[in-house]
Interface confidence: medium
């Protein structure tokens, strides 16, 4: 069963001092975001018992395994059902506490009733404040039964439930007709899924015989021990004031467990701590009684004395629950109450016994849950005991359950049952996740969901190059940390798998599914430098660079040019996707801007060192484009261009620039300055006959302006002259014959 305890502090004189605490002894309980355990939940359950709304209750977490509910302002806040949920996965368990008002009309003689399937349950509500009306019994909030007020017996209303079945479990209440629900007596009925002493799916298995008021769990056959007792059969008492499956928890406060109600997983329910009784768990046991709710009687023999927390304390020479066994009778010594092994292992189990006559090897045997008897393979005989060693055949899941060590001599016999848990080694259900990669390393998250049993003690990461037959490399990592695989080959696929282990021999699980993780390319190491740059317009920049000469192939896929505009805080990146390129034209830049420029080599996603930066100032933007540009052939070597001045000029034009290019030609265009800005025509001379030319022009003020539209015109051929006179501008004319 899950080690989960719900503690209710029953000092009811002041509701503000009331608190509920849920304590988990489970490994990793309550860490919440931690992948190995969901959080503890502690809340009031208003589905059945509804109370008037009040200020919200305060929840405080104390470390990973404890949560406390406070903030009760009035007694009615306390009445009802509270639940704590803890444990992970299939072990998630709900513990329930039912609180009754001490001032209610009816009070339960006993709040929690645990009965076996087929038993008769009797709920008894004691009259605290009499009303001469019917008593209504409800089950889980719905009407169940009516009792006439005359039907009280010795001041109690009894509800008899014959032949109860598990669906009968739940919260029962007895209320006088028309009385406030807060004046009800609330009960909790827990019906085990099997008859007395049985457990398992078909109730075919025999319970271990839980001692000291422990209750056999109908699903797993384990004893749910009362607070203050431990061991497979609850045979061992904790020290006063301690509780939990291993007695690891301590009752708060100087008065120990006085005034505390303990609620444990079903089918136990709730009770006072060991040594205490009464509706508020504030009364010590009467002489001769001990245990939770003081339900147990000592009946000590042979001079034993009764301790209200642990039962009989035997004098020297005697042992047993009632000090009824002489030390001459053989006795199993120091047998662990619970052992854990991994599936398919072949463990050795030791069983030690003493007595008079002295036990020998053949007098000690080990019995498995299926009845198979194992004989010891060797025995170690010491003056005070004989220890028999048993070699257990390969374990299967069916070996989980109660084993028994038995010693028999002529002096009598003794046996000790102990629980064997066969655990399934964990197997990852998913592949590890790649977090980041570099050329020679991979960062991996090994944390994956798994089948089988925890806790996870170690995580092994196995990896090797894909399609390789070489041995796997292995790294052992902490389950909760990411791991870096180092010294890998660049640009290489690696198969990576997780293997989980749990504690103990044979705890290594099978390897999980593989995943392919690929390292990055090698980083480019060459640092380029900027050879030069020139402005080709207010928004265009031609850049050239070089690389140092090194032997071997170039490690790189291309270049990245970066332009940083410090004024605006903007970066422009230009990708040049050929590693052979040494020049690039950057367009669409912002005129009049001061840029910082650098270039770096890249390979895959990795960048090499950047060149030393250069600082470039683009000229400010020029005027708008000239309008209505027109070309007219004058001869076989002359074409006249006419235009209109740009509109909305920001200042006086300093010159025009004409661009001349042979149509369909592959060469660079030629630029010709027109230095007389007041002119609106010019003659371009020295052209080739019968050749088609493209013309466009732009004006300049401080910087060059936008280009005009492009016009086409062909020079004349065969010596033909154009008609009409020609007026030419005094433009600078250059021959275009080359």
């Amino acid at each position: 069963a899950v080690d989960l305890t719900l503690l209710a502090n029953l000092r009811l004189t002041d509701p503000q001092r009331f608190f509920l605490t849920c304590v988990s002894g489970e490994a990793g309980a309550g860490r919440g975001s931690d992948a190995w355990g969901p959080p503890l939940l502690l809340e009031k359950d208003d589905r059945i018992v509804r109370t008037p709304p009040g200020p919200p209750l305060r929840l405080a977490r104390n470390g990973s395994h404890q949560v406390t509910l406070r903030g009760f302002s009035k007694p009615s806040d306390l009445v009802g059902v509270f639940s704590c949920v803890g444990g992970a996965g299939a072990r998630r368990t709900r513990v329930i506490y039912v609180h009754n008002s001490p001032g209610a009309h009816l009070l339960p003689d006993k709040v929690t009733h645990t009965v076996n399937k087929g038993d008769t349950a009797v709920l008894s509500a004691r009259v605290h404040k009499e009303k001469q009306t019917d008593v209504i019994w409800k089950s889980n909030g719905s009407y169940f039964y009516t009792l006439d007020w005359h039907e009280a017996q010795d001041g109690r209303f009894l509800l008899q439930l014959p032949n109860v079945q598990p669906p009968s479990s739940g919260i029962y209440s007895a209320t006088y007709l028309e009385a406030s629900p807060l004046g009800s007596a609330f009960f909790r009925l827990i019906v085990r899924g099997c008859g007395a002493g049985r457990w398992g799916p078909g109730c075919t298995k025999e319970c271990p015989g839980c001692l000291h008021g422990g209750v056999c769990h109908d699903h797993d056959g384990e004893c749910v021990c009362p607070p203050g007792f431990t061991g497979t059969r609850c045979e061992q008492a904790c020290r006063e004031g301690r509780f939990g499956q291993s007695c690891q928890e301590q009752c708060p406060g100087i008065s120990g467990c006085r005034g505390l109600t303990f609620c444990l997983p079903d089918p136990y329910g709730c009770s006072c701590g060991s040594g205490w009784r009464g509706s508020q768990c504030q009364e010590a046991c009467a002489p001769g009684h001990f245990g939770a709710d003081c339900r147990l009687q000592c009946q000590c023999q042979n001079g034993g004395t009764c301790d209200r927390f642990s039962g009989c304390v035997c004098p020297s020479g005697w042992h047993g629950v009632h000090c009824e066994k002489s030390d001459r009778i053989p006795q199993i010594l120091n047998m662990a109450s619970e052992l854990e092994f991994n599936l398919e292992t072949m463990p050795r189990i030791n069983c030690a016994a003493a007595g008079n006559p002295f036990p020998v090897r053949g007098s000690i045997e080990l019995r498995k849950p299926d009845g198979t008897v194992l004989l010891s393979t060797k025995a170690i005989v010491e003056p005070e005991k004989t220890t028999a060693e048993f070699e257990v055949p390969r374990l299967v899941l069916a070996d989980s359950g109660f084993w028994e060590c038995r010693v028999s001599t002529s002096g009598g016999q003794d046996s000790r049952r102990f629980k064997v848990n066969v655990k399934v080694p964990p197997v990852p259900l998913a592949a590890p996740r790649l977090l980041t990669k570099q050329s020679r390393q991979l960062v991996v998250s090994p944390l994956v969901s798994f089948s089988g049993d925890g806790p996870i003690s170690t995580v092994r990461l196995h990896y090797r190059p894909q399609d390789s037959t070489m041995d796997w490399s292995t790294i052992v990592v902490d389950p909760s940390e990411n791991v870096t695989l180092m010294n890998l080959r660049p640009k290489t696929g690696y198969s990576v798998r997780v293997q989980l282990s749990r504690p103990g021999e044979g705890g290594e699980g099978a390897w999980g599914p593989p995943t392919l993780m690929t390292t990055d390319c090698p980083e480019p190491l060459l640092q380029p430098w900027l050879e030069g740059w020139h402005v080709e317009g207010t928004d265009r920049l031609r850049v050239s660079w070089s690389l140092p000469l090194v032997p071997g192939p170039l490690v790189g896929d291309g270049f990245l040019l970066r332009l940083w505009d410090g004024t605006r805080g903007q970066e422009r990146r230009e990708n040049v996707s050929s590693p052979q390129a040494r020049t690039a034209l950057l367009t669409g830049l912002t005129p009049g801007t001061h840029y910082q420029l650098d270039v770096q080599l890249y390979h895959c996603t990795l960048l090499g060192p950047a060149s030393p930066p250069a600082h470039v100032l683009l000229p400010p933007s020029g005027p708008p484009a000239p309008r209505h540009l027109h070309a007219q052939a004058l001869s076989d070597s002359e074409i006249q261009l006419t235009w209109k001045h740009p509109e909305a000029l920001p200042g006086p034009i300093s010159k025009y620039v004409v661009e001349v290019q042979v149509a369909g030609g592959a060469g660079d265009p030629l630029w010709i300055d027109v230095d007389r800005p007041e002119e609106t025509s010019t003659i371009i001379r020295g052209l080739n006959a019968s050749t088609r030319y493209l013309f466009r022009m732009r004006a300049s003020i401080q910087g060059l302006g936008d280009w005009s539209n492009t016009v086409e015109e062909s020079t004349l051929g065969n010596g033909l002259q154009a008609e009409g006179p020609v007026q030419e501008s005094r433009a600078a004319e250059e021959g275009l014959d080359q």
Partner: antibody, heavy 117, light 106 residues
């Protein structure tokens, strides 16, 4: 569906006896308080008797000592044994399921008892 | 015994009207009171229990109030099917019915 079906009514002479039955279905009969209520022709309702699930009984003063209410939980049946009948006992007799939370929430259609010579 | 007195004995109203019927107990019955509707030739039908709690399936135009000795059944926006006889019943000490109020169409 909850159903209550009365039977056993009829004509009887003064001083005679009659046993009424009420067959219950559609609910767990053994958990509920049950009533007999009667209504004389053209008159109002009059509570006659009640019985708790455990068998505790109560009677109206007008029938005390003459009528006996009983139940058989195994047969899901309520009974009213009427002795020493008088003319004023003439009425439609209804059985009703008693207070879930103080009210008869289901009633039968009634059976007519006529006491006349 | 506890006596229950209902008033009025007869009540005339029209469809759409609102009406109130009063029930007095001869001693304090807390809220142990139920109201029933009975149509001619039919069994009574529970409308209200615990003085003011509406039985499931009963229209919300019916409402109950009061505690101790004075109780009222109110029907708002009368519908044709509401014309019937209404009874109160105390359940504080055994049981007693009021003499009934016949609600007729005006």
């Amino acid at each position: 569906e909850v159903q209550l079906l009365e039977s056993g009514g009829g004509l009887v002479q003064p001083g005679g006896s009659l046993r009424l039955s009420c067959a219950a279905s559609g609910f767990t009969f053994s958990y509920y308080k049950m009533w007999w209520v009667r209504q004389a022709p053209g008159k109002g309702l009059e509570w006659v008797s009640s019985i708790s699930p455990g068998g505790w009984t109560h009677y109206a003063d007008s029938v005390k000592g003459r009528f006996t209410i009983s139940r058989d939980n195994s047969k899901n049946t309520l009974y009213l044994q009427m002795n020493s009948l008088r003319a004023e006992d003439t009425a439609v007799y209804y059985c009703a399921r008693g207070p879930v939370s103080s009210g008869g929430d289901y009633w039968g259609q009634g059976t007519l008892v006529t006491v006349s010579s | 015994d506890i006596q229950m007195t209902q008033s009025p004995s007869f009540l005339s109203a029209s469809v759409g009207d609102s009406v109130a019927i009063t029930c007095r107990a001869s001693q304090d019955i807390s809220r142990f009171l139920a109201w029933y509707q009975q149509r001619p030739g039919k069994a009574p039908k529970l409308l209200i229990f615990s003085a003011s709690t509406l039985q499931s399936g009963v229209p919300s135009r019916f409402s109950g109030s009061g505690s101790g000795t004075e109780f009222t059944l109110t029907i708002n926006a009368l519908q044709p099917e509401d014309f019937a006889t209404y009874y109160c019943q105390q359940l504080s000490r055994y049981s007693t019915f009021g003499q009934g109020t016949k609600l007729e169409i005006k």
